[in-house]
Structure formats: structure tokens, C-alpha cells
Interface confidence: low
């Protein structure tokens, strides 16, 4: 189970993980105390290559080709959490692990 | 964490799980002894609706809108295995649990 890593200079057309820094201040999300920004990454690219497909199911659906099936798309296949300090709706400060905030790997599914 | 269920008569445009029976015999996959067919299901539909997004990350990337980011796509968010009886490459009969063969839920990621 693997995925490709790319950067803004890459010429790779296949499904790939790209760096992306999310800046909460830039969004105006001022209820987030820390981190103010973090490396989230994102997935982009084409999915016509079998070796990047995460599940055998993806290949089977491609073969069956049902109505409305758009084919596999490039999406996170492994994600990890980050620890965040933020205000909740009652203006209390919360420290917690927020799941699925960082893309570690991309694949076709 | 939830997803929509549809069928071939649905007018639903959002990301949805549709029924699909995979027929191994029809594919010519004669190394699979059993099952000869099974209900695999598949995902299809649009992903512009926040409530079907699986991860907060999806919403953040949409806000950041990086180059090449195609927006979330409708993909399996929960899958389950099936038990299969099949010939391996050495012509031995194997009985095993094959992961991620059935789509239980679809979402936008």
C-alpha cells in the first residue's frame, strides 16, 4: 500500500500527494488558538493506473462499469490527526486530538 | 458518520451508494471458486454538500483551493470483507477473508 509524493514542480499526472499548508488565520478561523497553520497536504491527479488503486473493489467496479460510475478518483487513503487548542461553542478552551487532518498517502478509490 | 443509499430509480444527485452485483464468471475470472457473484455496491454522485464530507480536512482543502485540487469526490468511506474460495498462483485452493470487497458507505473525501 503506497502512494506517490509530488511538489509544485512535479510533472507527474498520476494521483499524488502534494504539500499544502492550511492557514487558519487566513481563513478567519480565529477560534483556533494553536496551531495557527499546519501542513495538511492534499491529493490530486489521474486514476487510470491500477497500481495506485487501494482496493480490489475499485478494479471490479471499473470492470463492471455500472451506470453513473465515474471511475476511481484520487483521494486520501491514509490520514493522521493533529493536536489542537481551540475555543468551543461555549468559549471554553479545549485541547484535543482532531482526527483526519493530515493526508499521509493518496490513492485511487 | 453516515451516507446516502440509492437505487437505479433514484433521482438523488448527491454522493450515494448504489447496488452492484459483481459476477466473476461474467468477467472470466475462473480462478474464483466461490462466490461466483456477490453484492459489491459502488459510489456515485456529486460532492458539493458539506454534510457528506467525511473529514474536516476535505472542508479545509476546499477553502484553501490549491492548484490542481479537484474538490472532494464520491468514494467508499466504509468497506467490509468477504470470504472467498479461490486458486492461488500455485494452483492451491485457498479459503480466506478478502478485505475491502463490499462498499458499506459512501462519502465525499
Amino acid at each position: 500500500d503506497f502512494g506517490l509524493d509530488c511538489d509544485e514542480h512535479s510533472t507527474e499526472s498520476r494521483c499524488c500527494r502534494y504539500p499544502l499548508t492550511v492557514d487558519f488565520e487566513a481563513f478567519g478561523w480565529d477560534w483556533i488558538i494553536a496551531p495557527k497553520r499546519y501542513k495538511a497536504n492534499y491529493c490530486s491527479g489521474e486514476c487510470e493506473f491500477v497500481f495506485l488503486q487501494k482496493y480490489p473493489h475499485t478494479h471490479l467496479v471499473h470492470q463492471a462499469n455500472p451506470r453513473g460510475s465515474a471511475g476511481p478518483c484520487c483521494t486520501p487513503t491514509k490520514m493522521s490527526p493533529i493536536n489542537m487548542l481551540y475555543f468551543n461553542g461555549k468559549e471554553q478552551i479545549i485541547y484535543g486530538k482532531i482526527p483526519a487532518m493530515v493526508v499521509d498517502r493518496c490513492g485511487c478509490s | 458518520d453516515f451516507g446516502l443509499d440509492c437505487d437505479e430509480h433514484s433521482t438523488e444527485s448527491r454522493c450515494c451508494r448504489y447496488p452492484l452485483t459483481v459476477d466473476f464468471e461474467a468477467f472470466g475470472w475462473d480462478w474464483i471458486i466461490a462466490p461466483k457473484r456477490y453484492k459489491a455496491n459502488y459510489c456515485s454522485g456529486e460532492c458539493e454538500f458539506v454534510f457528506l464530507q467525511k473529514y474536516p480536512h476535505t472542508h479545509l482543502v476546499h477553502q484553501a483551493n490549491p492548484r490542481g485540487s479537484a474538490g472532494p469526490c464520491c468514494t467508499p468511506t466504509k468497506m467490509s470483507p468477504i470470504n472467498m474460495l479461490y486458486f492461488n498462483g500455485k494452483e492451491q485452493i485457498i479459503y480466506g477473508k478478502i478485505p475491502a470487497m463490499v462498499v458499506d458507505r459512501c462519502g465525499c473525501s
Epitope: 478567519g28 480565529d30 | 453516515f2 451516507g3 438523488e12 477553502q63
Partner: antibody, heavy 122, light 110 residues
Framework: EVQLVESGGGLVQPGGSLRLSCAVS????????KGWVRQAPGKGLEWIGI???????YYASWAKGRFTISRDNSKNTVYLQMNSLRAEDTAVYFC????????????????WGQGTLVTVSS | AVVMTQSPATLSLSPGERVTLSCQAS??????LSWYQQKPGQPPKLLIY???TLASGVPSRFKGSGSGTDFTLTISSLQPEDAATYYC????????????FGQGTKVEIK
């Protein structure tokens, strides 16, 4: 104290305009989705529209073009601009706050103002 | 757009009785349903969201259930202070972040 207070209602002639204000206190305006809902005398609730955390607005189909929602974070106030008013727009107008400050529950309003009455009549 | 239909229009029951209010969506809305209570001269109060989650401060005698197109609000033992009009409400993604309310059910105390 956490509260929403609407103002700006009153009597207006058909074809006229009115701007309603919703002053919020006790929380940060930009952290929450805000909505406007109206209720004609003796009738049920009718959704007008929302402004979400990022400032995007969404409207009921009947309100598009005539009604505009905006906000001023520095004044902690949300506005509803109503144009080309008709007799059937006569109602109590409520300002409401979405219950989730991460923007995923745009539609569940857990904090409401007392409402302001708008009467459209000649 | 989704249309929400509530039944009955009016209900008259005695204190202590079990109350069942119904809300039907014109198409599947999964769990995207909220219930509100409104008393005369007051704004609505959120009771239930996501079909079955009790809002903060709401007594446990209120219970929401259902998914897809059929939803129910149950008051296990009616109290005098529960006399009000109850509205269901959904989020309608198809009309791009639209919200639809049911027409309401008025609960009276005998």
C-alpha cells in the same frame, strides 16, 4: 450574556425597503452560522437564508434577489436587507445562530432572538 | 426541494400521557432532521438535532427517532409546560443549503 437582539422592524409601504439588524453579544459573530427565519401571523416558520462562517450566503428560492444577508464583524451585527416588500412579507422576523461553531451544522439553530415585527401595508 | 409534512395538525392529550408526533420527508434526508418547540409569543427552541440527538438542556422525556423519510418525536410523559407547537426541520442539500420546516403540530393539554 449570550443573546441575539433584532431591530429595525416596523410599518413599511408595499414596494418599500427595510433593513433589519441582529446584534449579537456573548460570543464571536464570525465563529457561527447565522440564519434568518420569519413567521407570518398565526402561521408556521419559514426559512429565509443563512450566512456561514466564511461569509457565504444561501437563500430560500423565494428570497433570492429581494433579500440580502450580510454581516459586520466589527459591530457584531448581522443584517437582513429586504427590498420590493409585499403584503405577504408581513411577519415576525427572527435571527438565529447555528449550534456548531465548526460550520458543519448550518441549519440547527439553538439560539434565537425574540424577533422583530415587519408590517407591509399601505 | 424537500417538502416536510407533519401529522397530526393538532393533538389534545392529558398530562402524563405519551405523545407521538410524526414528520415525513418527500425524499430521503437520512438523519438530517431537527425538532423545535415554540410557545406563543416566544422564539422556537431547539429540542433534537440529527434526528435523535438531544439538544443541551432539553429534558430526557423528549426523544427523536427515525431516518430516511419517516421521523418521530416522542414525549414519554406529557407535562403542562409541553403545551406548544412543534416543528420539524431539515437541511436540503439538493437546493444548495436550503432549509425546510414542516407546517407544525400543535399540542394542547386537556
Amino acid at each position: 450574556e449570550v443573546q441575539l437582539v433584532e431591530s429595525g422592524g416596523g410599518l413599511v409601504q408595499p414596494g418599500g425597503s427595510l433593513r433589519l439588524s441582529c446584534a449579537v453579544s456573548g460570543f464571536t459573530l464570525s465563529h457561527y452560522v447565522k440564519g434568518w427565519v420569519r413567521q407570518a401571523p398565526g402561521k408556521g416558520l419559514e426559512w429565509i437564508g443563512i450566512i456561514n462562517i466564511s461569509g457565504s450566503t444561501y437563500y430560500a428560492s423565494w428570497a433570492k434577489g429581494r433579500f440580502t444577508i450580510s454581516r459586520d464583524n466589527s459591530k457584531n451585527t448581522v443584517y437582513l436587507q429586504m427590498n420590493s416588500l409585499r403584503a405577504e412579507d408581513t411577519a415576525v422576523y427572527f435571527c438565529a445562530r447555528g449550534h456548531d461553531n465548526f460550520g458543519y451544522s448550518y441549519h440547527d439553530f439553538n439560539l434565537w432572538g425574540q424577533g422583530t415585527l415587519v408590517t407591509v401595508s399601505s | 426541494a424537500v417538502v416536510m409534512t407533519q401529522s397530526p395538525a393538532t393533538l389534545s392529550l392529558s398530562p402524563g400521557e405519551r405523545v407521538t408526533l410524526s414528520c415525513q420527508a418527500s425524499q430521503s434526508i437520512h438523519h438530517e432532521l431537527s425538532w423545535y418547540q415554540q410557545k406563543p409569543g416566544q422564539p422556537p427552541k431547539l429540542l433534537i438535532y440529527l434526528a435523535s440527538t438531544l439538544a443541551s438542556g432539553v429534558p430526557s422525556r423528549f426523544k427523536g427517532s427515525g431516518s430516511g423519510t419517516d421521523f418521530t418525536l416522542t414525549i414519554s410523559s406529557l407535562q403542562p409546560e409541553d403545551a406548544a407547537t412543534y416543528y420539524c426541520q431539515t437541511y436540503d442539500g439538493i437546493s444548495h443549503y436550503g432549509v425546510a420546516f414542516g407546517q407544525g403540530t400543535k399540542v394542547e393539554i386537556k
